[in-house]
């Protein structure tokens, strides 16, 4: 996580700052949502447990042509230790359960806020 924030600031970013910035971005998305987010695209739901950053990225990376979540995708890639590409399928996905991107973002945001409150940044 120490190399996060390359697009936002020149130096390394503390994990708490990186998580705070991700939360801020998800809040921006929910606040600025007028039309259905990403045209109502559906993504795999995930289990919000260890490894959920990669799982979240694996879900969202399959949404193309949605500028609203591009920054989120970039930020999540900083939290995920391995390279993620479209079509990957994690064991953390809830099989057969797809939800709208807007709901996915809300669920992820709530979970990240709780992690921030508990001081769990990694």
């Amino acid at each position: 996580l120490t190399c996060l924030g390359g697009f936002a600031s020149p130096g390394p970013v503390p994990p708490s700052t990186a998580l705070r910035e991700l939360i801020e971005e998800l809040v921006n998305i929910t606040q600025n949502q007028k039309a259905p987010l990403c045209n109502g695209s559906m993504v795999w739901s995930i289990n919000l447990t260890a490894g959920m950053y990669c799982a979240a990225l694996e879900s969202l990376i399959n949404v193309s042509g949605c500028s609203a979540i591009e920054k989120t995708q970039r930020m999540l890639s900083g939290f995920c230790p391995h390279k993620v590409s479209a079509g990957q399928f994690s064991s953390l996905h809830v099989r057969d359960t797809k939800i709208e991107v807007a709901q996915f973002v809300k669920d992820l945001l709530l979970h990240l806020k709780k992690l921030f409150r508990e001081g769990q940044f990694n």
Epitope: S16, L19, R20, I23, E24, V27, T30, Q31, L48, K106, L109, L110, H111, K113, K114, F116, R117, G119, F121
Partner: antibody, heavy 125, light 112 residues
Framework: QVQLVQSGAEVKKPGSSVKVSCKAS????????MHWVRQAPGQGLEWMGT????????KYVPKFQGRVTITADESTSTAYMELSSLRSEDTAVYYC??????????????????WGQGTLVTVSS | DIVMTQSPLSLPVTPGEPASISCRSS???????????LEWYLQKPGQSPRLLIY???DRFSGVPDRFSGSGSGTDFTLKISRVEADDVGIYYC?????????FGQGTKLEIK
């Protein structure tokens, strides 16, 4: 509107258990932490523990560890606090409270913004 | 456990006069995320507690601007610029930064 409605007063014998409920309305309990705080007669407030109803994770004050169990049922929007091996010193008003998280602030207040009306538990032989 | 010590324990105030309550923590209560979860609650006679101030100085919605919080590290203060009769009750500080979270012993504000 937001409400936390607790179960009624209880009289218990020493050594027994009590389970107090806290029914939430006007919000989703998975978006919160639910806390339990107690107040002995004429005394101050004492935080006992909390639960994240989204995943069941709990935190307890060490002095209550092993005697207190906090649970939550998302389907009924109800939080519970069970205290076992009761003794006379456990006579108190027990409050539930919530800390809410929302979509519209990056840094919520996280504090206990709504409280139940309190449940008096009397432990007496 | 972090001990929260309030002073004074009893505070008689004339309506219209200011009031100040001090809260000292036994160790620094800055959370690992950089926030300080220092809160103030008021419990009026026969009622449940209610939130006044969170994160040291942020007023909760509906709380009059007569109430203000300040401080850092281990020393915190709740000020009421002009006390009203309706302000009577017991004021508690609370730290939610380090588990177990703890309350101060309370300060009883009464009208002279």
């Amino acid at each position: 509107q937001v409400q936390l409605v607790q179960s009624g007063a209880e009289v218990k014998k020493p050594g027994s258990s009590v389970k107090v409920s806290c029914k939430a309305s006007g919000f989703y309990i998975k978006d919160t932490y639910m806390h339990w705080v107690r107040q002995a007669p004429g005394q101050g407030l004492e935080w006992m523990g909390t639960i994240d109803p989204a995943n069941g994770n709990t935190k307890y004050v060490p002095k209550f560890q092993g005697r207190v169990t906090i649970t939550a049922d998302e389907s009924t929007s109800t939080a519970y606090m069970e205290l076992s091996s009761l003794r006379s010193e456990d006579t108190a008003v027990y409050y539930c409270a919530r800390s809410i998280y929302d979509d519209y602030h990056y840094d919520d207040y996280y504090a206990m913004d709504y409280w139940g009306q309190g449940t008096l538990v009397t432990v007496s032989s | 456990d972090i001990v929260m010590t309030q002073s004074p324990l009893s505070l008689p105030v004339t309506p219209g006069e200011p009031a100040s309550i001090s809260c000292r923590s036994s160790q620094n209560i800055v959370h690992i995320n950089g926030n300080t979860y220092l809160e103030w609650y008021l419990q009026k006679p026969g009622q449940s507690p209610r939130l006044l101030i969170y994160k040291i100085s942020d007023r909760f919605s509906g709380v009059p601007d007569r109430f203000s919080g300040s401080g850092s590290g281990t020393d915190f203060t709740l000020k009421i610029s002009r006390v009203e009769a309706d302000d009577v009750g017991i004021y508690y500080c609370f730290q939610g930064s380090h588990v177990p979270w703890t309350f101060g012993q309370g300060t009883k504000l009464e009208i002279k």
